[in-house]
């Protein structure tokens, strides 16, 4: 007879503690760091994942790339404040009372300020551009095969509705995946493009968030697709508000 404890895991989030003590002995999983209950039938929100990650700190990885209107996650890891639904709170502050506003994917979209800083609303990131460079291969990948494989990946592994994968561009060795999802398009139960992009980013880095699944093995017509660098650009429904000093730096 299999122990309940053995069957009680969260397939979509290994950074959880699970026990079969929910209603009627349901397996109930809580995110590390926040202790919030998570729905293991779908992706966990990026905010809760970041919080869990900070509760068991590893080497911080950061991306630094200037851009015009697109935001890049230059600040790297931080311990975020999440709302009761697991979304990022619009205003984030650190232990030294330095505060800033973030978008729906938790990326800073204003200059840093003090506790008086106001962030009126959580601005939605409606367009994400994932920029990949793959390792050299014998020849270029067939564009339509690559397109189909990446769309399948986002549909099957991340459960993102196909309509939110707007395009896949390819100019060897650069691959660009465009995700688009306006507030009005996102229905209840839809995976958020920000969460899907974060799971993909962690997969690409060999840090899969899925429980017990092997790492990401991306193949196009049997040929391994090995990514050597990733950049993710975030475009918000309302442009970010940075001082001119930062924009001209």
């Amino acid at each position: 007879h299999t122990a309940a404890q053995d069957n009680c895991t969260c397939p979509t989030n290994k950074m959880t503690v699970c026990s079969p003590d929910g209603p009627g002995g349901r397996c109930q999983c809580r995110a590390l760091g926040s202790g919030m209950a998570v729905d293991c039938s779908t992706l966990t929100s990026k905010c809760l994942l970041l919080k869990a990650r900070m509760s068991a700190p590893k080497n911080a990885r950061t991306l630094v790339r200037p851009s015009e209107h697109a935001l890049v996650d230059n600040d790297g890891l931080y311990d975020p404040d999440c709302d009761p639904e697991g979304r990022f709170k619009a205003r984030q502050c650190n232990q030294t009372s330095v505060c800033w506003c973030v978008n729906s994917v938790g990326v800073r979209r204003t200059d840093k300020g003090d506790l008086s800083l106001r962030c009126d609303e959580l601005v939605r990131t409606h367009h994400i551009l994932i920029d990949l460079r793959h390792r050299p291969t014998a020849g270029a990948f067939n564009h339509s095969d690559l397109d189909a494989e990446l769309r399948r990946l986002f549909r099957e592994r991340y459960r993102l509705h196909p309509k939110f994968v707007a395009a896949v561009h390819y100019e060897q060795p650069t691959i660009q995946i465009e995700l688009r999802q306006n507030t009005s398009q996102k229905a209840a139960g839809d995976v958020d493009i920000g969460d899907a992009a974060y799971y993909f980013e962690r997969d690409i880095k060999g840090e899969s968030l899925f429980q017990g699944r092997g790492g990401l093995d991306l193949r196009v017509r049997g040929e391994p697709l090995q990514v050597e660098r990733t950049l993710i650009y975030y475009l918000d429904e309302i442009p970010p508000k940075f001082s001119m000093k930062r924009l001209t730096a």
Partner: antibody, heavy 116, light 107 residues
């Protein structure tokens, strides 16, 4: 195989307390929740509460909050349900049931009669 | 609390009949629904859990279906040993709540 053996029938006076036991065997006691359900004569099933011996966490039906106490003794693999301030409406068969994801194994039931 | 409305409260049927019992929740319960069979003087017995999963050892003539607020237990061909009372249970949230029961009697 999974077995839940409950204590025998009880006759109690109004205002007194009753403690029903449920001895589990055939599985690891701390891995599953135990729920308590009662059934008044000729009536349907009514959920009273749930205890998880693994962490001693519990949930009660608000109706029994303050009157019912669920406990678990890990050394003897036994769950207990104590109901105080008994009244005639508490006359019922009391069941313990091991649950996992809604799938239940039930004890044989304990008849508690409250009568003056 | 989530209310579970079970219907009918009783029904008469013959051996070989197809029998359908329904349970309606006062709100969506995400398929967290079980069905139990109880015979007089006996403890309930699990038939179905998670709305449509058959418990090991339960005959395949029993099946569960539904989603959201509406769920159904079907007995495809009623057998003599199936005459009993059937209960649904929601375990989407605390407190767990049972339907009022359906008594299946011989016509």
């Amino acid at each position: 195989q999974v077995q839940l053996v409950q204590s025998g029938a009880e006759v109690k006076k109004p205002g007194s307390s009753v403690k029903v036991s449920c001895k589990a065997s055939g599985y690891r006691f701390t891995d599953y929740v135990i729920n308590w359900v009662r059934q008044a004569p000729g009536q349907g099933l009514e959920w009273m509460g749930q205890i998880y011996p693994g962490s001693d966490s519990f949930h009660y039906n608000q109706k029994f909050q303050g009157r019912a106490t669920l406990t678990a003794d890990k050394s003897t693999n036994t769950a207990y349900m104590e109901l105080s301030s008994l009244r005639s409406e508490d006359t019922a068969v009391y069941y313990c049931a091991r649950f996992f994801e809604g799938l239940a194994y039930w004890g044989q039931g304990t008849l508690v009669t409250v009568s003056s | 609390d989530i209310q579970m409305t079970q219907s009918p409260s009783s029904l008469s049927a013959s051996v070989g009949d197809r029998v359908t019992i329904t349970c309606k929740a006062s709100q969506g319960i995400n398929n967290y629904l079980s069905w139990y069979q109880q015979k007089p003087g006996k403890a309930p017995k699990s038939l179905i859990y998670r709305a449509n999963r058959l418990v090991d050892g339960v005959p395949s003539r029993f099946s569960g279906s539904g989603s959201g607020q509406d769920y159904t237990l079907t007995i495809s061909s009623l057998q003599p040993e199936d005459f009993a009372t059937y209960y649904c249970l929601q375990y989407d949230e605390f407190p767990l709540t049972f339907g009022g029961g359906t008594k299946v009697e011989i016509k």
